[in-house]
């Protein structure tokens, strides 16, 4: 049988409260936003040549959080490092890319100046999921 | 990653036993009943992301990148986050009180570095 | 050392209530689960259900939901059991257990109450 | 629920004969989560064998418990007068967690 006294949260109300909604100006709790970004601007356009710009998705937002707010995990959803740590005081949870979760970048690159070109993946470079941990 | 060592400020990985008596999880975390979790802290200062093994990943320089050039250096925190989990076996009650034995992913800090 | 103290016997009339105590002495209580256990004269062993000292939580088995009301007071060290609308099935000598933790993830009710012993009579 | 059943229900042996119970469950049970336990008239429990195979504090070495998935067994290698009460396996690993009906052994 199910617990008779409820848990505070349930996994999918964990879910929301670590990945919350993706638009900036809903609030300002950690969340994942937009820039669109030319490597032209990095001074990375003699490398990568195409695409010139890209779609660069970064995680933003604060990570406070009051002590009798914590999600508590229920029966069946495993704790994350980060949760228990809102109780440690040097530990202060940073609004950033979840690890393991980054995308690659396709990009078509040259090293001699355009006289030739390849196709390559620039690692870890697009942020899929924004948590405080 | 760095360890800390109580002399360094840079972003490092700071040993912590996570008691789960005290955060009143041990009534449905069968075992252990604690463990290290260890957890990240310290500073991210922007050259940090040029040293081997400080910098989490390929978007971290891309952020750097930005700053340096003063583009946009507002919305963007440089963090000191995980780099490196590991698993831990756990023994815990699912949400119908079965009794699951896992290894459950991403539970104890390894190694930190500037996001 | 580790003791479960519960009382000897309860008398209870038909439909009344009976609410059995198991105190707890000998080690940390809010760390364990306490567990209940029903035995009928000459009869098996049936689990009814557990409690939590630390959060409070319960967990019933399914048959007894209804009839058993598990409830803490950690200042005391006591875990109660309250059971309702008795009948003449529910006489039977009521176990309280600890559930403990035997090492490398093996866990049992490793200490017992002597047990109550409740008769539901008019 | 997983339904634990014990047989015999009651047995009888001689003194110094080995004797085996067994416990069969309706659906597959983990071997960590197998107890026995052991029961004197008048009397609580007692935790006799967990985990399948590990003798609890101060049972003797005659007894010993084997099994997997839906079979369990308790044996005693050679039979002795304070051995014949009841025994009960139990598991824990599906809610509700349940008991056999137990075997009561008597001696001969």
């Known amino acids: 049988s199910a617990p008779s006294m409820p848990w505070p949260w349930s996994p999918a109300a964990l879910r929301l409260l670590q990945r919350p909604p993706e638009e900036p100006s809903a609030h300002a709790f950690c969340h994942r936003a937009a820039l669109n970004i030319s490597f032209q601007e990095l001074g990375w356009d003699r490398w990568i040549v195409h695409p010139p710009s890209f779609i660069f998705h970064y995680c933003h937002g604060s990570c406070g959080m009051p002590t009798s707010d914590l999600p508590l995990p229920v029966p069946g959803a495993p704790p994350t490092p980060a949760q228990p740590l809102f109780l440690v005081p040097g530990a202060k949870p940073c609004c950033a890319a979840l690890p393991g979760s980054m995308r690659s970048l396709r990009v078509r690159t040259t090293s001699d100046g355009g006289y030739s070109f390849k196709y390559e993946m620039v690692p870890n470079l697009i942020t899929q999921h924004c948590a405080c941990i | 990653g760095l360890e800390c060592d109580g002399r360094t400020s840079l972003c490092c990985r700071q040993q912590f036993f996570i008691d789960f008596r005290l955060i009143g999880w041990n009534d449905w975390i069968i075992a252990p009943t604690g463990y290290y979790g260890n957890y990240c802290e310290g500073s991210c200062p922007a050259y940090l992301a040029g040293v081997p093994g400080s910098a989490s990943s390929f978007h971290t320089a891309v952020v750097n990148q930005y700053r340096m050039r003063g583009l946009n250096p507002g919305p963007v925190n440089s963090c000191c986050i995980p780099t490196k989990l590991s698993s831990m076996s756990m023994l815990y009650f699912d949400d119908e009180y079965n009794i699951v034995k896992r290894d459950v992913p991403n539970m104890i800090v390894e190694e930190c570095g500037c996001a | 050392q580790v003791q479960l103290q519960q009382p000897g016997a309860e008398l209870v009339k038909p439909g009344a209530s009976v609410k059995l105590s198991c105190k707890a002495s000998g080690y940390t209580f809010t760390n364990y689960w306490m567990y209940w256990v029903k035995q009928r004269p000459g009869q098996g062993l049936e689990w009814i259900g557990m409690i939590h000292p630390n959060s409070g939580s319960t967990n019933y088995n399914g048959k007894f939901k209804t009839g058993a009301t598990l409830t803490v007071d950690k200042s005391s060290s006591t875990v109660y059991m309250q059971l309702s609308s008795l009948t003449s099935e529910d006489s039977a000598v009521y176990y309280c257990?600890?559930?403990?933790?035997?090492?490398?993830?093996?866990?049992?009710?490793?200490?017992w109450g002597q047990g109550t012993s409740v008769t539901v009579s008019s | 629920q997983i339904v634990l059943t014990q047989s015999p229900a009651i047995m009888s042996a001689s003194l110094g004969e080995r004797v085996t119970m067994t416990c069969t469950a309706s659906s597959s049970v983990s071997s960590s989560y197998f107890h026995w336990y052991q029961q004197k008239p008048g009397s609580s429990p007692k935790l006799w064998i967990y985990?399948?195979?590990n003798l609890a504090s101060g049972v003797p070495a005659r007894f010993s418990g084997s099994g997997s998935g839906t079979s369990y067994s308790l044996t005693i290698s050679t039979m002795e007068a304070e051995d014949a009460v009841t025994y009960y396996c139990h598991q824990y690993h599906r809610s509700p967690w349940t008991f056999g009906g137990g075997t009561k052994l008597e001696i001969k």
């Open positions: 985990s399948t195979s």
């Open positions: 257990a600890r559930w403990g933790y035997g090492g490398n993830y093996d866990y049992a009710m490793d200490y």
